[in-house]
Interface confidence: medium
């Protein structure tokens, strides 16, 4: 009985439906490889339901297993490009606590212009997610061709 | 108590796991750049449950934050032939009403045959996803090489 | 009424959020193209919570649809590397039991090093799902690089 | 049921040039996907032209601007006008069918037709 009514009476967030989708806001000063990541409604179709932004970096506020996703496009950019200027490589991990920094995901560009993909993995309250972007080549701001995000998938 | 009761009586559809996972019918005649897929267990590991498809068209039933994935290979493809034939650019979008068009995803082939990626998006009920396929080549129909898909994830 | 006290009383697993994330443990003998997969938290961030590892290969312990997602990166690969020893195919496919083996999923790597995509596909209780390399190149282990995982998504 | 039966075949000189039909029984015609693969001894199948329903065509690197595939949907029949052989075109030639059926996808085939190219 208590289940069903807790049911009724807390928010979404509380039945553990985090979820973050941002946008690019910018990339960092010439020695930090970070991409900055923006997100809310008046910025488009980017928001945060539970995780937050921290200085442009996404932190997570539930325990649990995400699905991590990314596509990141180089801004100009041909095949002939993306080889001249490898390696490109693009890798998410979390950053901080620092007693918990690892990498999750990593692609290079080689000769596309574009990499996508997506893991599942346990994060905690607290993780802070980075994207560090190596290499000269800049990313689109374009909302369809560069973006972040994570969904809580269970406990 | 009343929550408990809607859980054991509402078909799963009420409870908001539309889902949906198509393949691909035919591509348009010659100035339409829009895939046609269909879906249903008659035709293989294709599905809807919840969306419906309108024209070949992927139409939302329930408002919520969906992820859209989508992967397209192309049929006769080489990295020579993909680099010939460039620009070949796939987009996802919202297509109808007019008044939400917007382009969700957009990747471009470059020196590869194959595009795939995904995103978290908030669609509406209403709202027709279009996916064009702008260029050249031609998509393969393999249903493991070329599909298109949503999951409701929440309100 | 019994719902909720289902709820309370029941393990995550049967309220049905099966979910694996898998690392590369090794590649096969020569005529067997088949990667062989490793889980679990002494591992590093896989994982398996419902499916199960029968000699390297996921089985799938709940019929419903998956979200299968994969990642592989080859080993000591340039683009030139990659299109000299093309084709180089990766298929994730059920492939016992015998009467339901079918290709879910495939790509080639081209001139790229990483193939990275995911779909929505029915599994029942018992399906083993293989993931074929074929070609003479071979998989990266580092855990960012290469991964595969499912997570159930709806009945 | 979807028959396809090729015809054209033949010895040439390279150089030379030779046109293979396809003629295609049994469904509506318009809305396949259909194509031309071929198989060289020892070799992989390979697919070397493809066309739509409404004449979108794409050509595998090796035969394009030497090859022209077409059809023609009234007399329900796909041709292939091959140029400029070489001897590497030898091999024999598939006609191929994509088609949705209402029991899911069907791939149809013809029997195969020979095309040797001598220098």
């Known amino acids: 009985q208590r289940f069903a009514q807790a049911q009724q009476q807390l928010p979404l967030e509380s039945l553990g439906w985090d979820v973050a989708e941002l946008q690019l806001n910018h990339t960092g000063p010439q020695q930090d490889p970070r991409l900055y990541w923006q997100g809310g409604p008046a910025l488009g179709r980017s928001f945060l339901h539970g995780p937050e932004l921290d200085k442009g970096q996404l932190r997570i506020h539930r325990d649990g297993i995400y699905m991590v996703h990314i596509q990141v496009t180089l801004a100009i950019c041909s095949s002939t490009t993306a080889s001249r200027h490898h390696p490109t490589t693009l890798a998410v991990g979390i950053c901080s606590p620092a007693s918990r920094s690892i990498s999750l995901l990593r692609l290079s560009f080689h000769q596309g212009c574009t990499i996508a993909s997506q893991r599942l993995t346990p994060l905690a309250r607290g993780d802070t997610l980075c994207t560090n972007l190596t290499g000269t080549l800049l990313p689109s701001r374009n909302t369809d061709e560069t973006f972040f995000g994570v969904q809580w998938v269970r406990p | 108590q009343r929550f408990a009761q809607a859980q054991q009586q509402l078909p799963l559809e009420s409870l908001g796991w539309d889902v949906a996972e198509l393949q691909l019918n035919h591509t348009g005649p010659q100035q339409d750049p829009r895939l046609y897929w269909q879906g249903g267990p008659a035709l293989g590991r294709s599905f809807l449950h919840g969306p419906e498809l309108d024209k070949g068209q992927l139409r939302i039933h329930r408002d919520g934050i969906y992820m859209v994935h989508i992967q397209v290979t192309l049929a006769i493809c080489s990295s020579t032939t993909a680099s010939r034939h460039h620009p070949t650019t796939l987009a996802v979008g919202i297509c109808s009403p007019a008044s939400r068009s917007i382009s969700l995803l957009r990747l471009s082939f470059h020196q590869g045959c194959t595009i795939a990626s995904q995103r978290l998006t908030p669609l509406a009920r209403g709202d027709t996803l279009c996916t064009n396929l702008t260029g050249t080549l031609l998509p393969s129909r393999n249903t493991d090489e070329t599909f298109f898909g949503v999951q409701w994830v929440r309100p | 009424q019994r719902f909720a006290q289902a709820q309370q009383q029941l393990p995550l697993e049967s309220l049905g959020w099966d979910v694996a994330e898998l690392q590369l443990n090794h590649t096969g003998p020569q005529q067997d193209p088949r990667l062989y997969w490793q889980g679990g938290p002494a591992l590093g961030r896989s994982f398996l919570h419902g499916p199960e590892l029968d000699k390297g290969q996921l089985r799938i312990h709940r019929d419903g649809i998956y979200m299968v997602h994969i990642q592989v990166t080859l080993a000591i690969c340039s683009s030139t590397t990659a299109s000299r020893h093309h084709p180089t195919t990766l298929a994730v496919g059920i492939c016992s039991p015998a009467s339901r083996s079918i290709s879910l999923l495939r790509l080639s790597f081209h001139q790229g090093c990483t193939i990275a995509s995911q779909r929505l596909t029915p599994l029942a209780r018992g399906d083993t799902l293989c993931t074929n390399l074929t070609g003479t190149l071979l998989p990266s282990r580092n855990t960012d690089e290469t991964f595969f995982g499912v997570q159930w998504v709806r009945p | 049921e979807v028959q396809l039966v090729e015809s054209g075949g033949g010895m040439v000189q390279a150089g030379g040039s030779l046109r293979l039909s396809c003629a295609a029984s049994?469904?509506?015609?318009?809305?396949?996907?259909m194509g031309w693969y071929r198989q060289a001894p020892g070799k992989q199948r390979e697919l070397v032209a493809l066309?739509?329903?409404?004449?979108?065509?794409n050509y595998a690197d090796s035969v394009e601007g030497r090859f022209t595939i077409s059809r023609d949907n009234a007399k329900n029949t796909m041709y292939l006008q091959m140029n400029s052989l070489k001897p590497e075109d030898t091999a024999v030639y598939y006609c191929?069918?994509?088609?949705?059926?209402?029991?899911?996808?069907?791939?149809?085939w013809g029997q195969g037709t020979r095309v040797t190219v001598s220098s």
């Open positions: 066309i739509t329903g409404d004449g979108m065509t």
């Open positions: 049994g469904k509506p015609f318009s809305f396949y996907f």
């Open positions: 191929y069918a994509d088609v949705w059926a209402g029991a899911g996808r069907d791939e149809y």
